[in-house]
Interface confidence: medium
């Protein structure tokens, strides 16, 4: 046990206030009562402590709460949160969305730090699922949050939470993630009418199967090329030229510009050249006339 320096006469802190910024580190250690600090944490954020002084304050809280801080303290950590390590945060039990918001606010405008990632992980695990309010909050601070989750983690997202998702939240999602999210979105938006449904489901279509794309092609949705290019290749390949034409509507013109890129390139290779020619776009690479097309997947299923 290190011998502690005594607090100089008249310097014992009676409250957490601006006068403490003039204290040396050893004076803060000796003169600030940890329990007082814990009850007046909200004041710390309004005082321009140096990083070294904040280290002392953190040390005092660590001594007071070796098993992890209570939520009443966590909610008011403010800038002191930036001093916490992921190991510190793993000891916490954060259940209030207000606490989560308060700490995310401190880190606002910065990349998601390991501390924030650990905090979010603890919070979501504590709740058992990623509910709508939590998802709303997290995507407001970190638009890429949803796409940072594994498909396994995404499986805990209830369909009702999908209403909180904005198109930009899915920008960096890969096909495996969209495979998980799409069925949830389909369920969430099932009671909407045609055009409204398409607006909502559009961002999730990278996880849609062929039969759903075929169904959409019957609804005059006029899918834009950017959305089409994000569709699963295996879902696009079975679509006929007529179905793609209906699906894209006036945007079908854009196929020419994308004919060398997936999934358009692979889709062209599966179509009869005669059928492609009906589009009048000059798409080349289809199956020449007179050739027989064998659906090998069907053949394997029969044998």
């Amino acid at each position: 046990e290190v011998e502690k320096t005594a607090c100089p006469s008249g310097k014992k802190a009676r409250e957490i206030d601006e006068s403490l910024i003039f204290y040396k580190k050893w004076e803060l250690e000796a003169c600030v009562d940890a329990a007082l600090l814990a009850t007046q944490m909200d004041r710390v954020n309004a005082i321009p402590f140096t990083y070294e002084q904040l280290d002392v304050l953190k040390h005092k809280l660590d001594e007071l709460y070796p098993q992890g801080y209570p939520e009443s303290v966590i909610q008011h950590l403010g800038y002191l949160f930036l001093k916490m390590s992921p190991e510190d945060i793993r000891k916490w039990n954060v259940t209030s969305l207000e606490t989560l918001k308060a700490l995310l606010e401190v880190n606002k405008g910065h990349e998601m730090s390991p501390q924030v990632a650990t905090l979010i992980d603890r919070f979501v695990k504590g709740r058992g699922q990623l509910d709508k309010d939590t998802l709303d909050t997290l995507t407001a601070f970190y638009p890429g949050y949803l796409c940072s989750l594994s498909p396994e983690e995404l499986s805990s997202v209830p369909p009702s939470s999908i209403w909180a998702v904005r198109p930009q939240d899915l920008d960096t999602c890969d096909p495996r993630q969209l495979d998980v999210l799409y069925p949830k979105a389909r369920l969430a938006f099932q009671n909407m009418n045609g055009s409204e449904y398409f607006v909502k489901i559009q961002s999730f279509l990278g996880g849609a199967p062929t039969e759903d794309l075929k169904a959409l092609s019957q609804q005059n949705v006029s899918m834009d090329l950017a959305t089409f290019m994000k569709l699963r290749t295996d879902a696009v390949l079975p679509l006929t030229v007529a179905e793609v034409q209906k699906l894209l509507g006036p945007h079908v013109e854009g196929l020419k510009a994308e004919e060398r890129h997936r999934p358009v390139r692979d889709w062209i290779l599966r179509q009869r050249q005669d059928d492609l020619d009906t589009l009048g776009l000059g798409l080349q690479g289809g199956i020449p006339n007179g050739y027989l097309v064998l659906d090998l997947s069907m053949q394997e299923a029969l044998s």
């Epitope: 206030d17 800038y79 606010e105």
Partner: nanobody, 115 residues
Framework: QVQLVESGGGLVQPGGSLRLSCAAS????????MRWYRQAPGKGLEYIAG???????YYADSVKGRFTISRDNSKNTLYLQMNSLRAEDTAVYYC?????????WGQGTQVTVSS
């Protein structure tokens, strides 16, 4: 968003006085502590004085007894009355506050103490 604009700086002789003002773009009634810092040529930022919303004041030892901080909530303005000025008080003086985890600073006002 809080905009802070300092004024009142200038050239003054040693022993003279100046009064700096810091006008805020929003009501300072709800803002907690407001502060004055200064930065002398080639030096770091130095905390000079602070005043909480309840009127409690704090001063660095270097200005204690010579400078007085005050605020007028009705005018959304913070003041720094500087008396018995010395050559070492020459610096750019900045007004500062923290609100919603954002640090807000004014553009600064130059104070030069010279004979």
């Amino acid at each position: 968003q809080v905009q802070l604009v300092e004024s009142g700086g200038g050239l003054v002789q040693p022993g003279g006085s100046l009064r700096l003002s810091c006008a805020a773009s929003t009501s300072i009634f709800s803002i907690g502590t407001m502060r004055w810092y200064r930065q002398a040529p080639g030096k770091g930022l130095e905390y000079i004085a602070g005043m909480t919303s309840d009127g409690t004041t704090y001063y660095a030892d270097s200005v204690k007894g010579r400078f007085t901080i005050s605020r007028d909530n009705s005018k959304n303005t913070l003041y720094l009355q500087m008396n018995s000025l010395r050559a070492e008080d020459t610096a750019v003086y900045y007004c500062n506050t923290v609100a919603h985890f954002q640090n807000y600073w004014g553009q600064g006002t130059q104070v030069t103490v010279s004979s």
